[in-house]
């Protein structure tokens, strides 16, 4: 059959691998597109075929599996590079077929260079550690399947450029790196280098992740509204601009959605007819506590507007709070000539 179910170029799976290192790439067909796995497909007589298009070329070509030392090989549904080279960058296609069935998908593979401090264009996973929270660990990611469980690899951990040796509160423990008590000074990029033997030589796997020390749940509190507050009264004359900031502090909470909103006479600003604009700004502390400010603005306030109730609301996983702004109409000062006349007993 000439027809083939073509899933196109799967750009969602932009795979990045380091130059001069082993890489194992699973055919995405079985992971994301088909309802059966490779073993089922293989036992049903289907064959998995790989080919590629080099970077900046249009020509699809077969992958050369006859390179010295089997540099590129296929094992079940995995394409292996031992190791990668920079010019392996391109779009790779895996096609599953027999005489009556065909399905294929392409995906981009980018071979990335790293500098001597492990900096690279690679997108880094971020691991958040709670500040002063007791022992916490990070684990060297994405090394499964590279060597059999019977092989014990050697793991070296680095912070930035530096080998982690005799650090006060950071201890390498094989695949794990333990932080005895995480501090702001522990923020940074951590790299594990996994060295393992295979086919008469050694290989290195380099994995870098970013550690960000964040606020501890032990210290987390419900949202705190700093403004509006009882000390500030927004006193305006009709025709003036009314500006009321709502400033809310949120403790860092993992996966919490922080929300701030205004109500005017109990309704969302979108649901009322007055001309209100709301501008939001967000800032973060070093431990990712968040301060959100929403400024409610009415360009030309009316006396009716000055009688309304303006309430700032805030919500996080820790709770919900609200605070009303004190808004009032400015009482015009008595005119000087009238007062003077009254003072002299004029009628």
């Amino acid at each position: 059959s000439e027809r083939c179910d073509d899933w196109g170029l799967d750009t969602m799976r932009q795979i990045q691998v380091f130059e001069d290192e082993p890489a194992r790439i699973k055919c995405p067909l079985f992971e994301h597109f088909l309802k059966f796995n490779y073993s089922t497909a293989h036992s049903a007589g289907l064959t998995l075929i790989w080919y590629w298009t080099r970077q900046d070329r249009d020509l699809e070509e077969p992958i050369n599996f006859r390179l010295p030392e089997n540099r590129i090989s296929k094992e079940k549904d995995v394409l292996w590079f031992r190791p990668t080279l920079l010019n392996d960058t391109g779009n790779y296609t895996c096609m599953l077929r027999n005489t009556t069935y065909c399905s294929k998908v392409a995906f981009p593979l980018e071979v990335v260079q790293k500098d001597s401090c492990f900096n690279s264009p690679m997108k880094l996973p971020v691991h958040k550690l709670y500040i002063e929270y007791g022992i916490q660990r990070i684990t060297c990611p994405n090394v499964d399947g590279y060597f059999p469980s019977s092989v014990k690899p050697t793991i070296t951990w680095y912070m930035g450029c530096y080998k982690i040796q005799n650090f006060n509160n950071v201890i390498p423990e094989g695949m794990n790196l333990s932080f005895l008590i995480a501090l702001i000074s522990n923020n940074g990029n951590y790299t594990c280098v996994v060295t393992y033997p295979e086919n008469g030589r050694t290989f290195h796997l380099t994995r870098t992740l970013t550690v960000k020390v964040v606020g501890s749940p032990k210290n987390a509190v419900p949202p705190v509204i700093h403004s509006p507050n009882d000390h500030v009264v927004y006193e305006k004359e009709p025709g003036e601009e009314l500006l009321i900031p709502c400033t809310v502090y949120f403790s860092f909470l993992m996966d919490s959605r922080n929300e701030v909103w205004w109500t005017i006479d109990g309704k969302k600003p979108d649901d009322i007819t007055i001309d209100v604009t709301i501008n939001e700004s967000i800032s973060h502390s070093r431990t990712e506590d968040e301060t959100r400010t929403q400024i409610l603005s009415i360009k030309k306030v009316t006396s009716e507007d000055l009688k309304r109730s303006y309430v700032c609301h805030a919500r996080s996983a820790k709770g919900e709070v609200a605070k009303a702004a004190k808004v009032k109409q400015k009482v015009p000062a008595p005119r000087y000539t009238v007062e003077l006349a009254c003072g002299f007993g004029a009628t």
Epitope: E19, D20, E21, K114, D115, S116, C117, V151, K152, P153, T154, I155, T156, Y158, C161, P172, G174, V193, T195, Y196, P197, G200, R201, T202, H204
Partner: antibody, heavy 112, light 111 residues
């Protein structure tokens, strides 16, 4: 720290075992390497024993040397059949990617 | 395979001057390169690892650079105490096809 021992004067063909003793280094977490230096010559890598237990030897060292982990604190280097060309200071060092720290070395003299 | 060629074999330097030592690998070693200093009767001392990272307690007058196959050790503001032999070492690959992971060494003589 790292310290080598066992170096002495031997006659050609007499097997000799050198021992590298470590303290403050967990041999289950670190690879160990042996390097030698003939008088007035450069550094010559002999081989490395990995935490996996796998040993790799330099092309010229295969069959002439045996590296083994003998305890939780010791790694041995056996010179199976020394020749006069094996006269050198033998160093043990922690690591396989880079070497640090090094022991002070132990001198082996092969002479008839 | 992965032979390390170090140049020059010997270099003279004046106190306060600069010395440059080069190391070339026969194939890319992906920045897995270290530099060592050795004085007579002593074991080698690590100066630099991962091509450019200064080992603990080493003077910042020592600078490592390079990538791929070509690497350089620069000693600036040379002092008489820098008189020693310097070696490069590749850590990218260990295999039984390798003759030596070290370069041949460079003797630095300080005048």
């Amino acid at each position: 720290s790292v310290e080598e021992s066992g170096g002495r004067l031997v006659t050609p063909g007499t097997p000799l075992t050198l021992t590298c003793t470590v303290s403050g280094i967990d041999l289950s977490s670190y690879d160990m390497s042996w390097v030698r230096q003939a008088p007035g010559e450069g550094l010559e890598w002999i081989g490395t024993i990995y935490v996996s237990g796998r040993v790799y030897y330099a092309t010229w060292a295969k069959g002439r040397f045996t590296i083994s982990k003998t305890s939780s604190t010791t790694v041995d280097l056996e010179i199976t059949s020394p020749t006069t060309e094996d006269t050198a200071t033998y160093f043990c060092a922690r690591g396989s990617i880079d070497y640090d720290p090094w022991g002070p070395g132990t001198l082996v003299t092969v002479s008839s | 395979a992965y032979d390390m060629t170090q140049t020059p074999a010997s270099v003279e330097a004046a106190v306060g001057g600069t010395v440059t030592i080069k190391c070339q690998a026969s194939q890319s070693i992906s920045s897995w390169l270290s530099w060592y200093q050795q004085k007579p009767g002593q074991p080698p001392k690590q100066l630099i690892y991962r091509a450019s990272t200064l080992a603990s307690g080493v003077s910042s007058r020592f600078k490592g650079s390079g990538s791929g196959t070509d690497y350089t050790l620069t000693i600036s503001g040379v002092q008489s105490d820098d008189a020693a032999t310097y070696y490069c070492q590749q850590g990218y690959i260990t295999s039984s096809n390798i003759k030596n992971v070290f370069g041949g060494g460079t003797e630095v003589v300080v005048k």
